[in-house]
Structures are given as C-alpha cells and as structure tokens.
C-alpha cells in the first residue's frame, strides 16, 4: 500500500492530476482482459504489448497521482468515460466495470470509497 498524501485530495487538484496522466495503458489493459487476449480490439495496437506489461504501465501512470480515494475515483471514472462508446453491449459494460473495480487492488492502491462509475449520462 502506498503512503497516503492528504486526507482525501482536493477535487480540483485531482482533476488536474487525472488530466495530466496517460490513462491509455489502463484502458488497453482492461480491454485486453475482457477480450480474453483476442485480437478483436483494434482501436489501439495492443497485440504487441502483453496484458501484464500494460498493467504495469497503467499502475505506473496511476502512481503519478496522489493515492487518495478521491483521485482514484476520478481516474476510474475517466477511464469508464473514455471507453464507454467502445463497449458494444450491456454485458461488455458490466465486464469492463468489474475489471475497472479491480484495478486499484491490482496496482496495490487504496480502493476508492463510494465511487460512482455510472458517470456517462446513461450512455453506458
């Protein structure tokens, strides 16, 4: 578990940090997980990079932010928002959400409390 910097993280500061980090490795990692390593997902060139490598890159990016529940929630919501239109059906949305929820634990970060991942205004 990384050390905690600040009790919750100020909202505007979290937004700035999430804007600054590259969340694509996290999006690719989750897409690879739910596609079962199939080559169906060609929005990114993900075949050249193994899922475990993407996970490490994702964790490295998230490590650039404050380890607060507030900032982690903001990052997860942004990932969901970014990928929403690529998720083809309800089942895929649920799979993506499940993998997304596991991401903090995979990176050995604090899971955010009370984090609403249904942020896409009904699109997802």
């Amino acid at each position: 578990m990384r050390r905690e910097r600040g009790r919750q993280g100020d909202s505007s500061s979290c937004e700035r940090q999430v804007d600054r980090v590259n969340l694509k490795p996290c999006e690719q990692h989750i897409m690879q997980r739910i596609m079962g390593e199939q080559e169906q997902y060609d929005s990114y060139d993900i075949r050249s990079t193994r899922s475990s490598d993407q996970q490490q890159r994702c964790c490295d990016e998230l490590n650039e932010m404050e380890n607060t529940q507030r900032c982690m929630c903001e990052a997860l919501q942004q990932i969901m928002e970014n990928q929403c239109d690529r998720l083809q059906d309800r089942q895929m949305v649920q799979q993506f959400k499940r993998e997304l929820m596991n991401l903090p634990q995979q990176c050995n970060f604090r899971a955010p409390q009370r984090c609403d991942l249904d942020v896409s205004g009904g699109r997802c």
Epitope: R7, Q8, G9, D10, S11, E15, Q69, R70, C73, E74, Q77, M101, A111, P112, Q113, R114, C115, D116, L117, D118
Partner: antibody, heavy 123, light 110 residues
Framework: EVQLVESGGGLVQPGGSLRLSCAAS????????MTWIRQAPGKGLEWVAN????????DYLDSVRGRFTISRDNAKSSLYLQMNSLRAEDTAVYYC????????????????WGQGTLVTVSS | QSVLTQPPSISAAPGQKVTISCSGT????????VSWYQQLPRTAPRLLIF???KRPSGIPDRFSGSKSGSSATLGITGLQTGDEAHYFC???????????FGGGTKLTVL
C-alpha cells in the same frame, strides 16, 4: 421486522453531556454501517456521524468532531452517541439509522430510521 | 446554507408529474451516489431512491431517480395528496468526508 429504538435524549445545559443509545433488532447488526442524523426544530436533515461495521472507521460532521463520539457494541446490537460540550445549536431530534453502504462502489443510504429522540440544549 | 441546492417549494395538481432537482459539485454528486428521502409531517424520513436510480422494495414506481453530471433529479408521476411532504436529497462529499443533505423541498399537492 427491522426496528431501531433511540433513547437518552432530554434537556441539558450548554457545556453538558448526554449519551444517546439505539437498540437495533430484526437484522444482522454487525454487517451494516450505522449513522446518526439530526433535525433541528423546523429545519432540514443533517448527518452527524457514520461508523463502519466493525467500528474501525468513523466519520463526523466538522462541527461535532472532537465533541461527539460514535461507537457500537455488536454483541448487544447497539449504537451509541456520546455528546460532550453541548451547544444550543445541537438542539435537535436525533435519528439512529441503518446505512446501506456496502463496498467501494456503492453509496450511503439510510433505509431504516428510528422514531428519533429529542435533545434540547438550553440554560 | 446547504451545499446541495434544492428548490424550497414546488406545487402541482393531483395526477400531474413533478421533478425535484438537487445540484451539487464534482466532489459530491459528481463522483458519488445520490439518495432521496420523503418526510411526511411529524414522522421520520423514508428512503425513496438509493444509488441514483434504485427503488427499495415497497416504493411505487411512480418515484424515479436520475443523475447527470453534478445534478440529480427525483421524479414523481401520478401525484397523490398523500405525496404532500418534504423531500431531501443526500450524497457523500469526498472533499469534506461527510454526508450532505439538500435543504429540502416542500411539495404541495393542490
């Protein structure tokens, strides 16, 4: 049937203390967050404090932090609120509520409420 | 002054539909789940909606909840005289580490 019964309210002078109790029945108390919520006469609802299932995490309204202490006894299915250094603005009906918060990806919601106990702080 | 803003009062005739808004910020409604409560005169509040859109058992489907960005809405269709009450929204605020309630909306059924 879920029941929450508060007790311990009454008239107290400014600077005084009171201990509110809430007896819970009809559900597995140890598996739920519990919450105190208050309502001043003719006013809206105000959250006071939360306590996690095992008592390991507590959150407080800023204006009561350091004066109020929330605690629980899972063996007795009871919730408590120790109120010290009471002020006139603490005058309210205090409700014991069951909080449905379960995990990282759910929210606080109060699905069962007691009848409330009135705390009056006045000289 | 509540951080979550609701209209103080609203009125409509029986059978009509009303919506009650609750507006907040990114640190509360924007990132967390919203719940709604009904308080009839001289009684404890009752949960109507939780996790933005879900209804507890026993709450009729005339009541609905939605959320978009930093605002939430409670909808009530087929208004009945028994719906005359105060309605409150609530959510967690991650910056304050506290649950916030809206100031409440008094619904009058004409």
């Amino acid at each position: 049937e879920v029941q929450l019964v508060e007790s311990g309210g009454g008239l107290v002078q400014p600077g005084g203390s009171l201990r509110l109790s809430c007896a819970a029945s009809g559900f597995k108390f140890s598996t739920f967050y519990m919450t105190w919520i208050r309502q001043a006469p003719g006013k809206g609802l105000e959250w006071v404090a939360n306590i996690k299932q095992d008592g390991s995490e507590k959150d407080y309204l800023d204006s009561v932090r350091g004066r109020f202490t929330i605690s629980r006894d899972n063996a007795k299915s009871s919730l408590y609120l120790q109120m010290n250094s009471l002020r006139a603005e603490d005058t309210a009906v205090y409700y014991c509520t069951r909080n449905g918060l379960q995990d990282s990806y759910s929210g606080d919601f109060f699905d069962h409420w007691g009848q409330g106990t009135l705390v009056t702080v006045s000289s | 002054q509540s951080v979550l803003t609701q209209p103080p009062s609203i009125s409509a005739a029986p059978g009509q539909k009303v919506t009650i808004s609750c507006s907040g910020t990114g640190s509360n409604i924007g990132h967390n789940y919203v719940s709604w409560y009904q308080q009839l005169p001289r009684t404890a509040p009752r949960l109507l909606i939780f996790d933005n859109t879900k209804r507890p058992s026993g709450i009729p489907d005339r009541f609905s909840g939605s959320k978009s960005g930093s605002s939430a809405t409670l909808g009530i269709t087929g208004l009945q005289t028994g719906d005359e009450a105060h309605y409150f929204c609530a959510t967690w605020d991650a910056d304050l580490s506290a649950v916030l309630f809206g100031g409440g909306t008094k619904l009058t059924v004409l």
